[in-house]
């Protein structure tokens, strides 16, 4: 379990996981005061710093990535971990600290002059190479929506949803990410049963549109757990 993994790393007082993947209800939380956390972000507290459960890199801070805290650990038990500095081992870009990216399993400095070419090359090469995904790239570099003069249309390569035009989101398609339509009422959606499961999707769906949530289709209540169909429904 998440708690046992964290306890083994001397991290105390982890509450139940907060929030959830798209379509999941959030969890109730309460603020906890404490003393400032040195060396971290000015808002962190050291006496009750609690790791943040996550399902994907985008949910973490800019200097973090989402992974299991133990090597070879349960993929469903993931928290936000500190990014890796230059020359440290990596498996994907998001693991490397800002200003760096993952090349041949090592975090290397991003040379902004040829950086865009590197990314385009990575997108091309990454088909079939799970370690070269673009997840988390958006928060690391200058290649953000500002570099795209027009918002991406459906099918355009993207790094995050803000790169896409209104009504589209950035979702995984094979091992890169493209702009796909945000789901409308009645469309089939993906309800993730456990943390981290959408990291396994090759064809990721967008989230449900505004005012909709991903819920089990009423006439499928009797079906077995594995075959239940979820659709976007009004709140």
């Amino acid at each position: 379990t998440l708690n046992s993994v964290l306890n083994s790393n001397a991290i105390k007082n982890l509450p139940p996981p907060l929030g959830g993947a798209a379509g999941h209800p959030g969890s109730a939380v309460s603020a906890a005061p404490g003393i400032l956390y040195p060396g971290g972000n000015k808002y962190q507290t050291i006496d009750n710093y609690q790791p943040y459960p996550c399902a994907e890199d985008e949910e973490c801070g800019t200097d973090e990535y989402c992974a299991s805290p133990t090597r070879g650990g349960d993929a469903g038990v993931q928290i936000c971990l500190a990014c890796r500095k230059r020359r440290k081992r990596c498996m994907r870009h998001a693991m490397c600290c800002p200003g760096n990216y993952c090349k041949n399993g090592i975090c290397v400095s991003s040379d902004q002059n040829h950086f865009r070419g590197e990314i385009e090359e990575t997108i091309t090469e990454s088909f079939g190479n799970d370690h070269s995904t673009l997840d988390g790239y958006s928060r690391r570099t200058t290649l953000s929506s500002k570099m795209y003069h027009t918002k991406g249309q459906e099918g355009s390569v993207c790094l995050r949803s803000s790169d896409c035009a209104s009504g589209l989101c950035c979702a995984r398609h094979f091992w890169s990410k493209i702009c796909k339509p945000v789901l409308k009422e009645g469309q089939v959606c993906t309800k993730h049963r456990r943390k981290g499961s959408h990291g396994l999707e090759i064809f990721q769906r967008c989230y449900c549109g505004e005012g909709l949530s991903c819920r089990i289709q009423k006439d499928h209540h009797q079906a077995s757990n594995s075959s239940r169909l979820h659709t976007c429904q009004r709140h």
Epitope: G19, V29, Y43, N48, P51, E59, C169
Partner: nanobody, 129 residues
């Protein structure tokens, strides 16, 4: 100039519903968490609900869980809060706030008001019994 403008407040009977909107201008807010806080007369400002930059994470105070739903539309730089089954104790001024994505995140980040850089002027919600 960055501005957050709330709308949708008003008076309603207990059990009724309201939908608050918060529109941000002056910069893109897709890399910010958006949240609602509230302050009742004579009480401290308290956290109500937040939604992360990634759109996939929502957080709620115990007192509103199951009754309020927070959402956002990044393309329109707008956050929403659907409030249903309202109670007299929900009466307060509701403030929209925006917090930047931090370098390191903890479970307390979304609920701590000092993390929020931008605040709206507030919208009054009054629930009568």
């Amino acid at each position: 100039e960055v501005q957050l403008v709330e709308s949708g407040g008003g008076s309603v009977q207990a059990g009724g519903s309201l939908r608050l909107s918060c529109t941000a201008s002056g910069r893109p807010f897709d890399n910010y968490a958006m949240a609602w806080f509230r302050q009742a007369p004579g009480k401290e400002r308290e956290f109500v609900a937040a939604i992360s930059w990634s759109l996939s994470r929502t957080h709620y105070a115990d007192s509103v869980k199951g009754r309020f739903t927070i959402s956002r539309d990044n393309a329109k730089n707008t956050a929403f809060m659907q409030m249903s089954s309202l109670k007299p104790e929900d009466t307060a001024v509701y403030y929209c706030a925006a917090a930047p994505r931090p370098k390191r995140i903890s479970v307390q980040y979304f609920t701590t008001s000092s993390n929020y850089d931008y605040w709206g002027q507030g919208t009054q919600v009054t629930v009568s019994s």
